[in-house]
């Protein structure tokens, strides 16, 4: 048994720097406690963007200062990352861990390439 994680290959952030994508995992068992982490991979360096642990059937809660928000429905997590700028363009990986009950399972998606284009500044009006 293994856990597979699916996420879209490409997402374009909105002009306000908001990107949303779905992270779906094929659970080999009936997990009650799940940890979802968004990782950013750039030049083979991996860093954590945000993480949340949730109980199945409950809402996904990120820390107050997190740039992520999300909702869960069954084995699907809808993730939104805000405050993105052009320099944040990169590969965003969804990592899912089934923490409880045993056994533990790890699932890592192939990543979603998020493209962020900074909006053009408004021209000064006379």
């Amino acid at each position: 048994k293994a856990m597979h994680v699916a996420q879209p290959a490409v997402v374009l952030a909105s002009s306000r720097g908001i990107a949303s994508f779905v992270c779906e995992y094929a659970s080999p068992g009936k997990a009650t406690e799940v940890r979802v982490t968004v990782l950013r991979q750039a030049d083979s360096q991996v860093t954590e963007v945000c993480a949340a642990t949730y109980m199945m059937g409950n809402e996904l809660t990120f820390l107050d200062d997190s740039i992520c928000t999300g909702t869960s429905s069954g084995n699907q997590v809808n993730l939104t990352i805000q405050g993105l700028r052009a320099m944040d363009t990169g590969l965003y990986i969804c990592k899912v861990e089934l923490m409880y009950p045993p056994p533990y399972y790890l699932g890592i998606g192939n990543g979603t390439q998020i493209y962020v284009i900074d909006p053009e500044p408004c021209p000064d009006s006379d």
Partner: antibody
Framework: QVQLVESGGGVVQPGRSLRLSCAAS????????MHWVRQAPGKGLEWVTF????????YYADSVKGRFTISRDNSKNTLYLQMNSLRAEDTAIYYC???????????WGQGTLVTVSS | EIVLTQSPGTLSLSPGERATLSCRAS???????LAWYQQKPGQAPRLLIY???SRATGIPDRFSGSGSGTDFTLTISRLEPEDFAVYYC?????????FGQGTKVEIK
Amino acid sequence: QVQLVESGGGVVQPGRSLRLSCAASGFTFSSYTMHWVRQAPGKGLEWVTFISYDGHNKYYADSVKGRFTISRDNSKNTLYLQMNSLRAEDTAIYYCARTGWLGPFDYWGQGTLVTVSS
Amino acid sequence: EIVLTQSPGTLSLSPGERATLSCRASQEVGDSYLAWYQQKPGQAPRLLIYGAFSRATGIPDRFSGSGSGTDFTLTISRLEPEDFAVYYCQQYGSSPWTFGQGTKVEIK
């Protein structure tokens, strides 16, 4: 830089207890799951136990279940292994290891030797 | 529990030669959650390869991993004197985390 330093090993009689510590530095300890792995003299690596980010979830190898307890203090950046009812077959070098972002054990301590002998 | 079996137990080669190490799993290792570690006498293991084929930070490109499912391979294209050590494979996709018994690469 990432550093893991184990301590607490030594010689102990069968049936007695020992507590190992692993002091972590150079990274945000609470953001990583951690493991203990052991290696008997001249043998291979054996996974012992795992602990989640907040210490809420713990998993153990069958060989130590009910005797060993893993814990962590995120405020002290320290991982612990409480070993009770020690047996001769528990004699090994005990390593603490960090789980990397993508799953493998990316950093290991230098190990601490536990010898169970009468 | 996923049991990992490494072969051969010992590999006797000369510097400059190619080393091919095998790791076979008793059941499928999901999404290639397989790692390779190098261990030298008196030292802790060091991560070489993760995800079956991705090199860890600072690992020379003479080390490469391949395989999927139940059969995995670690290849050292040209052995350097510092490569003579014991190599372990490990699966980390589910608990219990398991290691192979190791392959010793020794100087011929």
